[in-house]
């Protein structure tokens, strides 16, 4: 049993390492944003025993603009973008509590000269300009507006071979 893709969170990204049951993943606030105090960036693939369907828990994450970065200028296109903020530890505990976000929750603050990727604020959040469309078989499994109305898309890399190893179960590319 595996989970479908998790829900989208405004101003945040997530790189899913595993869709397996009980996998835990973390959303990362976009550069220039930070986790709002008291919200959680964590999600876990859990089983609804009544329906025997796996789903991701809903993160309470709210990514808010980082005031420290509001007045910084966009970087020139050639600037190397890197991050310099240590993420706060979070845990999925039975109580659902985690440390308050007193600082950015993730490595999402770019170096001073590269706080904002050029053009990233000029287009709708997460709006792709290229790539092929992937129709997800789980597109309507949760019914959240971000999942059912957003155009799904993908960018795939091609190369000489695929090394052996884990690949998210039940989720294959269409190339």
């Amino acid at each position: 049993i595996t989970c479908p893709p998790p829900m989208s969170v405004e101003h945040a990204d997530i790189w899913v390492k595993s869709y397996s049951l009980y996998s835990r993943e973390r959303y990362i606030c976009n550069s220039g944003f930070k986790r709002k105090a008291g919200t959680s960036s964590l999600t876990e693939c859990v089983l609804n025993k009544a329906t025997n369907v796996a789903h991701w828990t809903t993160p309470s994450l709210k990514c808010i603009r980082d005031p420290a970065l509001v007045h910084q200028r966009p970087a020139p296109p050639s600037t190397v973008t890197t991050a310099g903020v240590t993420p706060q530890p979070e845990s999925l505990s039975p109580s659902g509590k985690e440390p308050a976000a007193s600082s950015p929750s993730s490595n999402n603050t770019a170096a001073t000269t590269a706080a904002i990727v050029p053009g990233s604020q000029l287009m709708p959040s997460k709006s792709p300009s290229t790539g092929t469309t992937e129709i997800s078989s789980h597109e309507s499994s949760h019914g959240t507006p971000s999942q059912t109305t957003a155009k799904n898309w993908e960018l795939t890399a091609s190369a000489s071979h695929q090394p052996p190893g884990v690949y998210p179960q039940g989720h294959s590319d269409t190339t």
Epitope: P5, P6, M7, S8, V9, A12, D13, I14, W15, V16, K17, Y19, I28, C29, N30, S31, G32, T81, T82, A83, S106, N107, N108, A110, A114, A115, I116, V117, S120, S125, K126, S127, P128, S129, T130, G131, E134, S136, S146, Q147, A150, N152, W153, E154, L155, T156, A157, S158, A159, Q162, Y167, P168, H171, S172, D173, T175
Partner: nanobody, 122 residues
Framework: EVQLVESGGGLVQPGGSLRLSCVGS????????VGWYRQTPGKQREWVAV???????DYAGSVKGRFTISRDNAKNTVYLQMNSLKPEDTAVYYC????????????????WGQGTQVTVSS
């Protein structure tokens, strides 16, 4: 479709540094989320780090504080700066231009480059 070429691997002593490069060709690489993975013989591929289009990053616990991922969109390149290397960092390192299944939701593509070997040994 994006093609990837990794480079920069080599033999380094424990405590040393290396910088790996992942050059992407094809449309869309600059707006891709790009991840680094590593694999040792007989073991499963292990996620190391990711950088998203906004520049935000995330790291595996085993490399946090030692590795830094960055990108230069003008050069269509993503870097992995590896400091304070340990023998257990020895592996073939691969980069991956992720698949986006929902806005802001990414996973590894099934297509991989040839990788670059990193060996940490005295």
């Amino acid at each position: 479709e994006v093609q990837l070429v990794e480079s920069g691997g080599g033999l380094v002593q424990p405590g040393g540094s290396l910088r790996l490069s992942c050059v992407g060709s094809g449309d869309g690489f600059s707006i891709s989320a790009v991840g680094w993975y590593r694999q040792t013989p007989g073991k499963q591929r292990e996620w190391v780090a990711v950088i998203f289009a906004s520049g935000s990053t995330d790291y595996a616990g085993s490399v946090k504080g030692r590795f830094t991922i960055s990108r230069d969109n003008a050069k269509n390149t993503v870097y992995l700066q590896m400091n304070s290397l340990k023998p257990e960092d020895t592996a073939v390192y691969y980069c991956n231009a992720g698949v986006t299944t929902n806005p802001g939701v990414h996973r590894a593509s099934r297509h991989w480059g040839q990788g670059t070997q990193v060996t940490v040994s005295s």
